[in-house]
């Protein structure tokens, strides 16, 4: 999906209002310095591409993020403010359902959500030069 035509300001507002709080809740009890940010993004569409991938695509050691509260709200925000987004997700969700495992918060998941927090912070500061 090409995130170029999303309403970035509305997605940012939804993130600041509630999605960010849900990410913090998920990470509660974890030190903010515990994980290094290894995933980066260069502009808002790129950030949303990476956020979408880390949130909804199962990875080795962390198959369960798509059922978390922040993921549900992220899906809603992308569907509402990115034209045609929900139509592109049908095949991806069917494949994910087949692979879905029991919901467990692993250290790998915490690391992945830490990366997500970094991507969202970058999304909110699109004019900053890439480090």
């Amino acid at each position: 999906y090409d995130f170029t035509n999303c309403d970035f300001e509305k997605i940012k507002a939804a993130y600041l209002s509630t999605i960010s709080k849900d990410l913090i809740t998920y990470m509660s009890g974890t030190k903010s310095t515990e994980f290094n940010n290894t995933v980066s993004c260069s502009n808002r569409p790129h950030c949303l591409t990476e956020i979408q991938s880390l949130t909804f695509n199962p990875t080795a050691g962390c198959a369960s993020l798509a059922k978390e509260m922040f993921a549900m709200k992220t899906k809603a925000a992308l569907a509402i403010w990115c034209p045609g987004y929900s139509e592109t997700q049908i095949n991806a969700t069917q494949a994910m359902k087949k692979r879905r495992k029991r919901k467990v918060t692993t250290n790998k998941c915490l690391e992945q959500v830490s990366q997500l927090q970094g991507l969202w912070r970058r999304f909110n500061r699109p004019l900053l030069k890439q480090q």
């Epitope: 939804a14 509630t18 509260m69 809603a76 969700t93």
Partner: antibody
Framework: EVQLVQSGAEVKKPGESLKISCKSS????????INWVRQMPGKGLEWMGQ????????TYNGNFKGQVTISADKSISTAYLQWSSLKASDTAMYYC???????????????WGQGTTVTVSS | EIVMTQSPATLSVSPGERATLSCSVS???????LHWYQQKPGQSPRPWIF???NLASGIPARFSGSGSGTEFTLTISSLQSEDFAVYYC?????????FGGGTKVEIK
Amino acid sequence: EVQLVQSGAEVKKPGESLKISCKSSGYAFSSYWINWVRQMPGKGLEWMGQIFPGDGDTTYNGNFKGQVTISADKSISTAYLQWSSLKASDTAMYYCARSGFDYGYFYAMDYWGQGTTVTVSS
Amino acid sequence: EIVMTQSPATLSVSPGERATLSCSVSSSISSSNLHWYQQKPGQSPRPWIFGTSNLASGIPARFSGSGSGTEFTLTISSLQSEDFAVYYCQQWSSYPLTFGGGTKVEIK
């Protein structure tokens, strides 16, 4: 204008099956989660589960998982709640509710259907 | 699961008086994830307050919400006849979504 219109009241016998509906209009149906909420006679509200019509993704309250099935048909902008074998304890009012970001970007159930009364009695 | 406890179950108030409704949450949640709904007999619930303190569209300013963490409050500064109803708090912090048992505001 956003509207959620639910199917009419139902009277059923224990063991029968049932599928009630919630037809949406006035917004992009595929892009918003639809929730189902139960209210037993004289009682409070209980969240049963939700569906994202865009891809059919569902989340259930564990208390209702296996008891009901939530589905949606995008082509007619309609969500469904169904039972394969009703019990007397399923007698209740059932509401569908859209969830979305309000003007302050808080996420909540912003529009509700009028409710469907289900009565299960022998 | 997060348990929402509302008190009192019934509040008897005279028109013009102040009403304070409480919602206690079993584990701390962000204020952005606490909402209030109003329900009148024979009607569907209506969104009333979003994110602890933000009035839904068309809700009169005599209503206000406050709180944080595990304790939240809905206040009606001067009750009008149309305010007599049941009010539910609800959390959107974790699954399953849960509602409080409701507070019925009735005429004294």
